[in-house]
């Protein structure tokens, strides 16, 4: 066979679908690899061919499009399962070709089982809701293209095993689930089951997502440096270890990059010759506010080091702040024989 541009196995598209449900899978060539769409390819005389390799097999085989009730079919650049079976799991390849051109890509498809409470190995998308922010909605995801707009499906929403009917602050509204005022108690997995008719059969689409209630932008503040502060003085003798924590609180901000760093005499620790180590730890509150601690450590501090300026800096999308640590050399305790004796008036 002549050469074909093989894009290999596209593991970025690990497609998971539920057993015994319809699935529509677009050929990834047109979405990620080629600069033209299916319509252009088709009008240029290119043909889209599908085949697959079963799980735990090496043999590529054509897809059987002659199954009863057209269980597997192809429509333009979409491969349809109506519905899937567990043993449809495998690597699927779509190949676009004519006599002079060939391009193909493979992708893994995993058909997974769910239990009566919608638990499964499916990776769940996370939807973040702001705490106490007024009405917010989540929408039943990835159901476009399964049925025409003339078909009116029934949608049922669940939290775990339980149909949402009269929750205090959660209202099912068709494809949307409305949270009147999101609270921490609303954290969890929510499932929509979309039921629609097609050619005398009834199909179900199950979609589960995780809701995580996070800090509201209404309450967001610039970073707050708790340490160093004006109340603590780091007083050391030369030769001792100097440890200064920089502890910063960051309000949750969607897509914000939180940064903490130290400067010593205005320079980054990497840019100076002294032997400094910095260890960072991060913790999160239930609403994903973040506390970062960077501990600056000098194992054996010198009198020169104790004269330097140590400044903790923090930055988020809300602003930038800095705070200097109060570092000083400990005054040595008086030597009894001389200083104290003089103090008592001895001659």
């Amino acid at each position: 066979s002549e050469r074909c541009d093989d894009w290999g196995l596209d593991t970025m598209r690990q497609i998971q679908v539920f057993e015994d449900e319809p699935a529509r899978i677009k050929c990834p060539l047109f979405e990620h690899f080629l600069k033209f769409n299916y319509s252009t390819a088709h009008s240029a005389g290119l043909t889209l061919i599908w085949y697959w390799t079963r799980q735990d097999r090496d043999l590529e085989e054509p897809i059987n499009f002659r199954l009863p009730e057209n269980r597997i079919s192809k429509e333009k650049d979409v491969l349809w399962f109506r519905p899937t079976l567990l043993n449809d799991t495998g690597n699927y390849t779509c190949m676009l070709r004519n006599t002079t051109y060939c391009s193909k890509v493979a992708f893994p498809l995993e058909v997974v089982q769910k239990d009566s409470c919608f638990n499964s190995p499916m990776k769940l998308p996370v939807h973040k809701l702001y705490i106490e922010y007024g009405i917010q909605r989540i929408t039943c995801p990835n159901v476009d293209g399964y049925f025409p707009s003339s078909v009116k499906p029934t949608i049922t929403w669940y939290m775990g095993c339980y149909k949402i009917q009269n929750f205090n602050n959660v209202i099912p509204e068709g494809m949307n689930l409305s949270f009147l005022i999101a609270l921490i108690s609303n954290n969890g997995n929510y499932t929509c089951v979309v039921t629609y008719p097609e050619n005398g059969r009834t199909f179900h689409l199950t979609r589960t997502l995780t809701v995580k209630v996070v800090g509201s932008p209404k309450n967001a503040v610039p970073p707050v440096i708790h340490s160093p502060n004006d109340h603590v003085v780091y007083e050391k003798e030369p030769g001792e270890e100097l440890l200064i924590p920089c502890t910063v609180y960051f309000s949750f901000l969607m897509d914000s990059r939180n940064e903490v760093w130290w400067t010593i005499d205005g320079k980054k620790p990497d840019d100076i010759t002294i032997d400094v180590t910095i260890n960072e730890s991060i913790s999160h509150s239930r609403t994903e506010d973040e506390t970062r601690t960077q501990i600056l450590s000098i194992k054996k501090v010198t009198s020169e080091d104790l004269k330097r300026s140590y400044v903790c800096h923090a930055r988020s999308a809300k602003g930038e702040v800095a705070k200097a640590a109060k570092v000083k050399q400990k005054v040595p305790a008086p030597r009894y024989t001389v200083e104290l004796a003089c103090g008592f008036g001895a001659t």
């Epitope: 009566s116 939290m159 775990g160 095993c161 009269n166 205090n168 108690s185």
Partner: antibody
């Protein structure tokens, strides 16, 4: 370890109401549901309804609709089942039961209370 | 609602023997079936869920099988503490429903 402790036995007159309590101890923070099930003397188990205390959602078996009210007090981790217009055939042991979370398929009746005998007699 | 029918109503077995209890659903409940054990004066105890998964702390002599409408609970070698009433329950469709029970008594 989660435990459910129910209120003591009750003797009631026909036409009156009874309110049985079920207190959860050692509760995890996860939301859960409390189920109510009854068992008449020498008979099988009959599901009556449930409540999800954290969300206030209740659902009742058709048979008890209009006569049963399930409530919960989150602050004391206590659920209540009130049955009104009692008749002699309501004489039964009333159980509360729960799972660890809302997500445990098949384990929503994992932990049971000790049962409360309600006798309806004139 | 789904009706669960258990058979036999009473099963007489000698200690050490195998006991096989049946449960039939009026329509398919997939594998969404649980078994409970109840001793006199006690609350029921979950034995099996998902038709075949033993609950925490349940001895290996208890096993469940079946799917759809036909289910079986097997006690491989009856111990004295196993004489009790056993209930099946479906949790595939609301309302969740119990069978009427099978009493396992000493022969």
């Amino acid at each position: 370890q989660v435990q459910l402790v129910q209120s003591g036995a009750e003797v009631k007159k026909p036409g009156s109401s009874v309110k049985v309590s079920c207190k959860a101890s050692g509760s995890p923070a996860e939301p859960y549901a409390i189920q109510w099930v009854r068992q008449a003397p020498g008979q099988g188990l009959e599901w009556m309804g449930y409540i999800i205390p954290l969300h206030g959602q209740v659902d009742y078996a058709q048979k008890f609709q209009g006569r049963v009210t399930i409530t919960a007090d989150e602050s004391t981790s206590t659920a209540y089942m009130e049955l009104s217009s009692l008749r002699s055939e309501d004489t039964a042991v009333y159980y509360c039961a729960r799972g660890q979370t809302l997500y445990d398929s098949g384990r929503q009746f994992d932990i049971w209370g000790q049962g409360t005998l309600v006798t309806v007699s004139s | 609602e789904i009706v669960m029918t258990q058979s036999p109503a009473t099963l007489s077995v000698s200690p050490g023997e195998r006991a096989t209890l049946s449960c039939r659903a009026s329509q398919s409940v997939s594998s969404n079936l649980a078994w409970y054990q109840q001793k006199p004066g006690q609350a029921p105890r979950l034995l099996i869920y998902g038709a075949s998964t033993r609950a925490t702390g349940i001895p290996a002599r208890f096993s469940g099988s079946g799917s759809g409408t036909e289910f079986t609970l097997t006690i491989s070698s009856l111990q004295s503490e196993d004489f009790a009433v056993y209930y099946c329950q479906q949790y595939n469709n609301w309302p969740w429903t119990f069978g009427q029970g099978t009493k396992v008594e000493i022969k």
